[in-house]
Interface confidence: low
């Protein structure tokens, strides 16, 4: 399987909410001994390997934000801890999983990584990640709503997030 990031860049005004999204692609085993661990964390640019550094999102580690379930199952973080920090990660039946960040501030700007690990008998068989950038803007140049930019370089048209 692979992880796709539909959008590589999210540009949002301060105070807005944003949902960063990744999508699980390809065949997914549904055996009883196979589960998927999905999570989110921040990283930094200029690394040899993107997403190798794991930083917290609003002081919450990837541990705090993880989802752990079988194949294309729906799940979401029930942690009060995450919600107190204005965060919620979720996963649907179609392989999409996301993190929603509420009331954005300039400090939220940076590189975000989604991580998916396929686990068989508690052993990590396959680990993939996706990366995207969030830019939070303030002032007269800031957009009125979040604007997202598709990952494909052929897509030149901006898509406004709902």
């Amino acid at each position: 399987f692979k992880v796709a990031t539909p959008y590589s860049l999210y540009v949002c005004p301060e105070g807005q909410n944003v949902t960063l999204t990744c999508r699980l692609l390809g065949p997914v085993d549904k055996g009883h001994d196979v589960t998927f661990y999905k999570t989110w964390y921040r990283s930094s640019r200029g690394e040899v390997q993107t997403c190798s550094e794991r930083r917290p999102i609003r002081n919450l580690t990837f541990q705090d934000l993880h989802l752990h379930h079988g194949g294309h199952q729906a799940a979401n973080t029930s942690h009060d801890l995450a919600q107190r920090h204005g965060l919620e990660s979720a996963s649907d039946h179609h392989g999409n999983f996301s993190i929603t960040m509420r009331n954005l501030t300039l400090l939220d700007s940076g590189l975000y990584c989604c991580l998916v690990v396929e686990i068989r008998h508690h052993h990590s068989e396959h680990r993939v990640h996706g990366a995207m950038e969030l830019q939070v803007q303030t002032g007269k140049d800031a957009p009125s709503n979040c604007v997202v930019y598709p990952s494909s370089s052929q897509d030149s048209e901006n898509i406004t997030a709902a």
Epitope: H79, I119, H122, S124
Partner: antibody, heavy 121, light 106 residues
């Protein structure tokens, strides 16, 4: 402050039992897999057992399989190691350690100070 | 079980020296290898994970490299506070530690 504190060690005769406890604080205990690692006097580190965050997955080293039982109580932020049929070679400092779960962990990043178990007649 | 062979078992070096420790796995473990530092009477401390990634807060004089079966841990410039025993540890899938390398100052 992220902290692990072990207790329950002591002197026990061969064939006896002990229950070690590890109290966790300063982090969301229920999100992490946990381990017991031991170190015999003057020797190296030996992994003993691990338990996943929700107790779904439990593993033991061959040297303790069938004699030791790992468990946890997430409501109490506590990890346990029940040690039965103790042998002289189980004499060691026992550490509990937090496993950074990826979910395949990339290391044990927080350790307790250790509790000493001595098995001797 | 995967065996980890660490060498040397002990070494003595001067302050400022470059120190290298090797660890060999009995079979391919990809990059599933960590390095720990243990000072006398203290609990181990994670220094490097996934063979080459420095744990947060660890000085940059520590580094790791390797993949497969052969791994290297390096202290680029030995400091007095680096006196300790260093352990490699694999996790593919269950943990085993190397025998340790005791580092002393000449």
């Amino acid at each position: 402050e992220v902290q692990l504190v072990e207790s329950g060690g002591g002197l026990v005769k061969p064939g006896g039992s002990l229950r070690l406890s590890c109290a966790a604080s300063g982090f969301t205990f229920s999100s992490y897999s946990m381990n017991w690692v031991r170190q015999a006097p003057g020797k190296g580190l030996e992994w003993v057992s691990s338990i996943s965050s929700s107790s779904s997955y439990i593993y033991y080293a061959d040297s303790v399989k069938g004699r030791f039982t790992i468990s946890r109580d997430n409501a109490k932020n506590s990890l346990y190691l029940q040690m039965n049929s103790l042998r002289a070679e189980d004499t060691a400092v026992y550490y509990c350690a937090r496993e950074v779960y990826d979910p395949h962990y990339y290391g044990m990043d927080v350790w307790g100070q250790g509790t000493t178990v001595t098995v001797s007649s | 079980d995967i065996q980890m062979t660490q060498s040397p078992s002990s070494l003595s070096a001067s302050v400022g020296d470059r120190v290298t420790i090797t660890c060999q796995a009995s079979q391919d473990i990809s990059n599933y290898l960590n390095w720990y530092q243990q000072k006398p009477g203290k609990a181990p401390k994670l220094l490097i994970y996934d063979a080459s990634n420095l744990e947060t807060g660890v000085p940059s004089r520590f580094s790791g490299s390797g993949s497969g079966t052969d791994f290297t841990f390096t202290i680029s410039s030995l400091q007095p506070e680096d006196i300790a025993t260093y352990y490699c540890q694999q996790y593919n899938p269950l943990p085993t530690f190397g025998g340790g390398t005791k580092v002393e100052i000449k």
